[in-house]
Interface confidence: medium
């Protein structure tokens, strides 16, 4: 399977909420012994590979934000830790996987990565990730609501399957 990023750039005004989204593409094994570990983190556009560096989102690590569920299940983070930081990650039955960030500040600007690990019986090494940019703006040039820019088909399909 692969991960697609429907939008490569989100431009939002300060104080707004935004939901960043990734989507699982291709055949997803829904066997009873297959589960998925999904998470989000901040990164930088590294020279070697985007998303190789895993930095916290609002002081929460990828570990704090992860979901672990069966291939046929929906899930979301319900723990207080994430919600206290204005964050919630969620996954639906259709392969959509998102993180919602509330009350954006300029400090939230940067590169965000979603990551999916397929776990088979023990732990599979099948990892895929997607990247997108968030720009938080303030002042008279800031949009009134979030503006999203679709990924080109090449960007969307060119996500790594490690």
């Amino acid at each position: 399977f692969k991960v697609a990023t429907p939008y490569s750039l989100y431009v939002c005004p300060e104080g707004q909420n935004v939901t960043l989204t990734c989507r699982l593409l291709g055949p997803v094994d829904k066997g009873h012994d297959v589960t998925f570990y999904k998470t989000w983190y901040r990164s930088s556009r590294g020279e070697v590979q985007t998303c190789s560096e895993r930095r916290p989102i609002r002081n929460l690590t990828f570990q704090d934000l992860h979901l672990h569920h069966g291939g046929h299940q929906a899930a979301n983070t319900s723990h207080d830790l994430a919600q206290r930081h204005g964050l919630e990650s969620a996954s639906d039955h259709h392969g959509n996987f998102s993180i919602t960030m509330r009350n954006l500040t300029l400090l939230d600007s940067g590169l965000y990565c979603c990551l999916v690990v397929e776990i088979r019986h023990h732990h599979s090494e099948h990892r895929v990730h997607g990247a997108m940019e968030l720009q938080v703006q303030t002042g008279k040039d800031a949009p009134s609501n979030c503006v999203v820019y679709p990924s080109s088909s090449q960007d969307s399909e060119n996500i790594t399957a490690a």
């Epitope: 570990q63 992860h66 672990h68 776990i119 099948h126």
Partner: antibody, heavy 118, light 104 residues
Framework: EVQLVESGGGLVQPGGSLRLSCAAS????????MSWVRQAPGKGLEWVAT????????YYLDSVKGRFTISRDNAKNSLYLQMNSLRAEDTAVYYC???????????WGQGTTVTVSS | EIVLTQSPDFQSVTPKEKVTITCSAT?????MHWYQQKPDQSPKLLIK???ELASGVPSRFSGSGSGTDFTLTINSLEAEDAATYYC???????FGQGTKLEIK
Amino acid sequence: EVQLVESGGGLVQPGGSLRLSCAASGFTFSSYTMSWVRQAPGKGLEWVATISNSGSYTYYLDSVKGRFTISRDNAKNSLYLQMNSLRAEDTAVYYCARDTVLSPFDYWGQGTTVTVSS
Amino acid sequence: EIVLTQSPDFQSVTPKEKVTITCSATSSISYMHWYQQKPDQSPKLLIKDTSELASGVPSRFSGSGSGTDFTLTINSLEAEDAATYYCHQRSSFTFGQGTKLEIK
């Protein structure tokens, strides 16, 4: 500081049972997958079992499946390994290890010794 | 199950020497991880994801490889590096048999 402290090891006869415990501190225990890894005397490392952060998913080494049960109590920051029908080949030091799925076992306890002998 | 075979099983080396430990897998894998275990101590994560040093690990350690062949290298060995080193992969959670490094 991340700390993992195992307890519950000891001498047990073949066919007997033991329950190992691992007390975790210094990190958000409920966010982490946890595992047990063992090391027989003078031998290498062997993974035994893994449990997801919520406890919903468990994974076992084939030779312990049906005999060992991994569990956790997130309210108590504790990991457990219930070992039944013990065999001589289960004799080992048992380590609990933190497991981030993305990274391998990044922190280990000091180990607790299980000896199965008549 | 993927089997990992390390080479050599044992090596006696002098300080400042360069040491190379190899780990060969029976099937192709994406990432290899390495642990160091000193006598009467718990294992310690050394390298994750083939080449990324774990926190606090000296830069004389490095990892490389892909597919079925992976390498742990210690440049300019120090006395404190006397230990057993294990490779590890997560597709079926297996470890190599270990390589014991003795300092002359």
